[in-house]
């Protein structure tokens, strides 16, 4: 599985979208975890609602929010008020019982806000820049996921 690299600005929000095969992962909750070391365990940060039918509702743990569109096959994780300590390797997971299948590996990189180092008068920051979309950032090769659209007969 390829690793997607996403960059976000310190103090702002970073949105991560993990797509998956909606049919294959039918009925399964999703989770966002942080990998501890290269081969270490993945420590759960937040998971979707305990009732799968309510997975569309946002679940929060600290500054991390998760929500799942189970029909579109997209789980969205938002890292709010991004800090340098949030940088690292994460996983989107699909849960089945005690098992977890990795949907996507994500390397989060935190960029220092240039306003911290320079005079604010020298820079123009557009209003929309308060949130970074993962899709707007260059990343490695696309992940090997099935389409989430209806099956062919």
């Amino acid at each position: 599985l390829n690793t997607t690299v996403l960059q976000g600005m310190a103090g702002q929000s970073l949105r991560v979208s993990c797509t998956y095969d909606a049919l294959k992962h039918w009925g399964r909750r999703k989770a966002w975890c942080r990998q501890l070391g290269e081969e270490g365990p993945c420590q759960r940060v937040v998971s979707t609602h305990g009732v799968w039918l309510l997975a569309f509702l946002k679940k929060r743990n600290g500054s991390t929010v998760i929500a799942d569109d189970t029909l579109a096959g997209t789980v969205t994780i938002t890292l709010k008020n991004l800090q340098a300590g949030d940088a690292g390797l994460y996983q989107c997971q699909s849960l089945r019982g005690r098992e977890a299948e990795v949907l996507q590996k994500v390397l989060v990189e935190v960029l220092e806000d240039p306003l911290d180092d320079q005079d604010a008068g020298d820079l123009w920051v557009p209003e929309e820049s308060s949130s970074f979309e993962g899709a707007q950032v260059e990343h490695s090769t696309s992940r090997n996921q099935e389409t989430s659209f209806p099956p062919t007969s």
């Epitope: 095969d21 909606a22 049919l23 294959k24 039918w26 009925g27 799968w52 039918l53 029909l71 099935e146 389409t147 209806p150 099956p151 062919t152 007969s153």
Partner: antibody
Framework: QVQLQESGPGLVKPSGTLSLTCAVS?????????WSWVRQPPGKGLEWIGE???????NYNPSLKSRVTISVDKSKNQFSLKLSSVTAADTAVYYC????????????WGQGTTVTVSS | DIQMTQSPSSLSASVGDRVTITCQAS??????LNWYQQKPGKAPKLLIY???NLATGVPSRFSGSGSGTDFTFTISSLQPEDIATYYC????????FGGGTKVEIK
Amino acid sequence: QVQLQESGPGLVKPSGTLSLTCAVSGGSISDSAWWSWVRQPPGKGLEWIGEIYHDADTNYNPSLKSRVTISVDKSKNQFSLKLSSVTAADTAVYYCARDTKYWGGMDVWGQGTTVTVSS
Amino acid sequence: DIQMTQSPSSLSASVGDRVTITCQASQDISNYLNWYQQKPGKAPKLLIYDASNLATGVPSRFSGSGSGTDFTFTISSLQPEDIATYYCQQYVEAPTFGGGTKVEIK
């Protein structure tokens, strides 16, 4: 269109293993679908046994999980059911079906095969 | 497991009658419910998926409605060829079927 055909022994001895195969024609087992097994004891209702995806991911009925194995053979475009430690209560018509869940339900079924458990 | 309770277990109606079958889920299943028709000695046939969508090739006299825990299946005008047993089925988790409703002609 996709068609399914079950095959396997019609008689299995108690404590033995029931083995059935479902051949998929008119389509590929790699199509986006869960390939399922459902059974129906004589004069009774339908009971879902389990299902398999083309990547060999499986889901089983919790009440049968310890005895059931479903596998897929992409090269032969078929999937199989094994049910171990059978008793007379496992006597039923066994159906294979294609399940696309929200995107169309169990829309394709085999004609069913009768399996009797008896010595 | 989600239990599906279907009623009645059997009914007798005249040709042209409106026939209604109900199905109740033991917990909220949204609209994730299908209806099947099974004639003696034959495999089940999908009639309605996602509670209210008519499957391909199914006559428009068949319809389904409901959401959450309570669902209804209707045959607007019973035909002789509709003699069969009808099953509801949920698929939120491990699929389970209702006990079936046997429909006969008076």
